[in-house]
């Protein structure tokens, strides 16, 4: 009996530990080639206003790859370039503004925005982004050429920032909080400009998530069994 | 739970001085910008005055009507928030509320119970 | 600095009923597509309560009665059906520029 309900206690937990390592959640967006992807990150606490902020790629099996970063500190409303993505930083407001121009198929795939806040890992800022690029223009006028060109209507003092040489292979996480948690940590949301066809879901890439969990949480697992089965062991 | 504790009011004669305090508990402090509001009776909702965190080197706001009157100030080691209020007038009469909002430029999620300032002959 | 305006000031509604209460800011209230407006409750005696932030976001535990719409100068609260305990006044509160400014109030009653 007692054998019975310490191996339900310890598959509660691991069940409950498995379900908070799928807590990372995804926004989906579907976009056309030539549109514009506009996210606005929101990370609410002063304390982060002049902290480096940057846009990262995930793919799958690698460690997030920073695309681009404002300066250290990080400057007020300060645009700056990379290639096609345009980052600017509003500490009065809070919000990180990234821009992707004129998108490409290729550019589909998981982004993320962080905090860098060294010796500390990065402060990743809730959600994800799943985006999806597709072939062929929409058709509606200001969604495509139109938006990346007055986007490109940028001073030309506009810099390029030295982004940190690590890459963290894993991002601190936590869950986006609701408005009145007391939480030190960022929340946000992402909105879309210039865009037509928009689809919202949240996706919850299952194997990946399922293998992560059980990565993650198999060394507390194998202590616990292990325990489990010695104090059984005559 | 986050807590809000005004103390400080009562009946003052006009051009008098009041210092409002704030005794906040059950959050990390140092990290919320903070404001007063008030409320004159039968009236409505006053935005006074907002101060920054140390990130920001504590920096102030305040609404036209108290200007050059009103100081708000923080003590984040005690976990405190102050008004000094200089050259009061009737129209100050009201309640004070202590307020903290969500982080920059966001709402304000938590008050406290108000203190009610007088100023009267 | 920013002037909102609510209207009406005072509004009877049956119970069950949809009550709709207007802000209107002197200019935009957005910064990016985000509506740096906000909604509260307030009963006699008591301090003021948030229900809807950036205009249309629903504060944790309160009813999905209450929603906000709106961008730029013109919000609404909208509180659908209507309940007893809704009896208040409501104000909008705007967060994007200094100073900081509320709506004059719009008092709910029940008819």
């Known amino acids: 009996m007692r054998k019975t309900r310490l191996w339900g206690l310890l598959w509660m937990l691991f069940v409950s530990e498995l379900r908070a390592a799928t807590k990372l959640t995804e926004e989906k967006y579907e976009l056309k080639e030539g549109q514009t992807l506009d996210v606005k990150c929101d990370y609410t606490l002063e304390k982060f206003a002049s902290s480096q902020k940057a846009w990262q790629i995930i793919r799958d099996g690698e460690m997030p790859k920073t695309l681009a970063c404002t300066e250290r500190p990080s400057k007020n409303s300060h645009p700056v370039q990379v290639g096609r993505i345009i980052l600017e930083d509003y500490h009065d407001h809070g919000l990180l503004r990234v821009r992707m121009v004129n998108l490409q198929v290729e550019d589909s795939g998981l982004y993320q925005c962080v905090i860098y806040q060294p010796p500390k890992e990065p402060h990743m800022l809730f959600d994800r982004i799943r985006l999806v690029v597709t072939k062929g223009f929409s058709g509606t006028p200001g969604s495509n050429e139109n938006s990346t060109q007055n986007v490109y209507k940028i001073p030309p003092t506009t810099t390029k920032a030295l982004c940190p040489l690590y890459t963290s292979p894993r991002t601190v996480t936590q869950a986006p909080p609701k408005s009145t948690a007391d939480v030190s940590t960022p929340d946000s949301e992402i909105n879309l400009t210039n865009v037509t066809d928009i689809i919202r879901v949240p996706v919850f890439n299952i194997v990946i998530l399922l293998a992560g969990g059980f990565l993650s949480k198999s060394l507390v697992f194998s202590v616990l069994f292990a325990v489990t089965l010695r104090s059984f062991v005559p | 739970e986050v807590q809000l504790v005004e103390s400080g009011g009562g009946l003052v004669q006009p051009k008098g001085s009041l210092k409002l305090s704030c005794g906040a508990s059950d959050f990390t402090f140092n990290t919320y910008a903070m404001h007063w509001v008030r409320q004159a009776p039968g009236m409505a909702l006053e935005w006074v005055a907002r101060i920054r965190t140390k990130s920001s080197n504590y920096a102030t706001y305040y609404a036209d009507s108290v200007k050059d009157r009103f100081t708000i100030s923080r003590d984040d080691s005690q976990n405190m928030l102050y008004l000094q209020m200089n050259n009061l007038k009737t129209e100050d009469t009201a309640m004070y509320y202590c307020v903290r909002d969500m982080g920059q430029r966001r709402q304000f999620a938590y008050w406290g119970q108000g203190t009610l300032v007088t100023v009267s002959a | 600095d920013i002037v909102l305006t609510q209207s009406p000031a005072s509004l009877a509604v049956s119970l069950g009923q949809r009550a709709t209460i207007s802000c209107r800011a002197s200019e935009s209230v957005d910064t990016f597509d985000y509506s740096f407006l906000h909604w509260y409750q307030q009963k006699p005696g008591q301090p003021p309560k948030l229900l809807i932030y950036?205009?249309?976001n629903l504060e944790s535990g309160i009813p999905a009665r209450f929603s906000g719409s709106g961008s730029r100068t013109d919000f609404t609260l909208t509180i659908n059906p209507v309940e007893a305990d809704d009896v208040a006044t409501y104000y909008c509160?705007?967060?994007?520029?200094?100073?900081?400014?509320f709506g004059g109030g719009t008092k709910l009653e029940i008819e």
């Open positions: 509160q705007q967060s994007n520029e200094d100073p900081y400014t």
């Open positions: 950036r205009a249309s």
